[in-house]
């Protein structure tokens, strides 16, 4: 499955929108930094078959979409930017879903992939727990926004590697 060129442009747009969503000076939030334990090894793309990589990417985007679709998120961010961001993520999910269906037919996905998807889910559980513990404060959301920008950058890089493999 070849992800359309518009998909990588969508990735870039999503990152730009996320960068624009900041509302407060990041410098006031330094002490709120937190180790969310991003599962970097699931995004290095070396040990993966293409179907596995696509399903991990799908899970990453899906969890990001879920996180920014909550009521608490709506209260934290400027509505028009949040809607645009969600739309970009939704489009990426559609692209990836089409690929997942196509690729799973080509190659069997080993159980190892379930571990990778579980690692991504647990990562987002840690983010949600952090937000809850911090009572969804503006700084907590700033830290999460920075973290998601970083994790989406990893996703973008994995997609670039997948395209080079084609």
């Amino acid at each position: 499955c070849d992800l359309p060129q518009t998909h990588s442009l969508g990735n870039r747009r999503a990152l730009i929108l996320l960068a624009q969503m900041g509302r407060i000076s990041h410098f006031s939030c330094l002490k709120d930094r937190h180790d969310f334990g991003f599962p970097e090894e699931e995004f290095d793309g070396h040990q993966f078959q293409k179907a596995q990589a696509i399903s991990v990417l799908h899970e990453m985007i899906q969890q990001t979409f879920n996180l920014f679709s909550t009521e608490d998120s709506s209260a934290a961010w400027e509505q028009s930017l949040l809607e645009k961001f969600s739309t970009e993520l939704y489009q990426q999910l559609n692209d990836l879903e089409a690929c997942v269906i196509q690729e799973v037919g080509v190659e069997e996905t080993p159980l190892m992939n379930e571990d990778s998807i579980l690692a991504v889910r647990k990562y987002f559980q840690r983010i949600t727990l952090y937000l809850t513990e911090k009572k969804y404060s503006p700084c907590a959301w700033e830290v999460v926004r920075a973290e998601i920008m970083r994790s989406l950058s990893f996703s973008t890089n994995l997609q670039k590697r997948l395209r080079r493999k084609d």
């Epitope: 960068a19 900041g22 000076s25 990041h26 410098f27 939030c29 330094l30 002490k31 709120d32 930094r33 937190h34 180790d35 969310f36 700033e142 830290v143 920075a146 973290e147 920008m149 970083r150 950058s153």
Partner: antibody, heavy 121, light 107 residues
Framework: EVQLVQSGAEVKKPGESLKISCKGS????????IGWVRQMPGKGLEWMGI????????AYSPSFQGQVTISADKSISTAYLQWSSLKASDTAMYYC??????????????WGQGTLVTVSS | DIQMTQSPSSLSASVGDRVTITCRAS??????LNWYQQKPGKAPKLLIY???SLQSGVPSRFSGSGSGTDFTLTISSLQPEDFATYYC?????????FGQGTKVEIK
């Protein structure tokens, strides 16, 4: 390869203005903050201030607030430190270093080679 | 501002010695402490971040510990290339602040 390359040594007279630079390469420039650190001859490290190149937001140490200006041009991946009126006491080595911002990652993991500023009449 | 106090300000040691440098913060900084090594005429080099994480490429003889207000940098077996000045720095809040430095000299 991540690199921060600073502009060359400067010799200035008191009262003159100066702008030194720090060019980042090998990484996404807007994903990291750039901090500036002063080291006077034979002395320790002093943090001056920091900039987020993505939106040019800045924070300064109270000791340097109003004395220097930190800026950045993300289109050319460069941060700047400037003085409008230099004093002899500004004679020092100035370093830039990258900071991961609000991410849980090593602070000031890469440094520029330093710019020696000498202010003398 | 958070004050960072290092001790000792200088020490003399021999190759193979175990060396310990301490850093105390004027208020709790959790684990937001970094250690740097600087050699004459060179830029500082990050050794330890978040109190105990070893920076990539740094030899394992360097280790960091502590949290709250008291922190330690340990060199388990001093090597000739370790003679330098060491600085702690808090990254808990702005303004960021450094310790005054500890110079490790050859005995």
């Amino acid at each position: 390869e991540v690199q921060l390359v600073q502009s060359g040594a400067e010799v200035k007279k008191p009262g003159e203005s100066l702008k030194i630079s720090c060019k980042g390469s090998g990484y996404s420039f807007t994903s990291y903050w750039i901090g500036w650190v002063r080291q006077m001859p034979g002395k320790g490290l002093e943090w001056m201030g920091i900039i987020d190149p993505s939106d040019s937001d800045t924070a300064y140490s109270p000791s340097f607030q109003g004395q220097v200006t930190i800026s950045a041009d993300k289109s050319i991946s460069t941060a700047y430190l400037q003085w409008s009126s230099l004093k002899a006491s500004d004679t020092a080595m100035y370093y830039c270093a990258r900071h991961p911002g609000l991410n849980w990652a090593p602070d000031f993991d890469y440094w520029g080679q330093g710019t020696l500023v000498t202010v003398s009449s | 501002d958070i004050q960072m106090t290092q001790s000792p300000s200088s020490l003399s040691a021999s190759v193979g010695d175990r060396v310990t440098i301490t850093c105390r913060a004027s208020q709790s900084i959790d684990g937001s402490l970094n250690w740097y090594q600087q050699k004459p005429g060179k830029a500082p080099k990050l050794l330890i971040y978040f109190a105990s994480s070893l920076q990539s490429g740094v030899p394992s003889r360097f280790s960091g510990s502590g949290s709250g207000t008291d922190f330690t940098l340990t060199i388990s077996s001093l090597q000739p290339e370790d003679f330098a000045t060491y600085y702690c720095q808090q990254s808990y809040d702005f303004p960021l602040t450094f310790g005054q430095g500890t110079k490790v000299e050859i005995k």
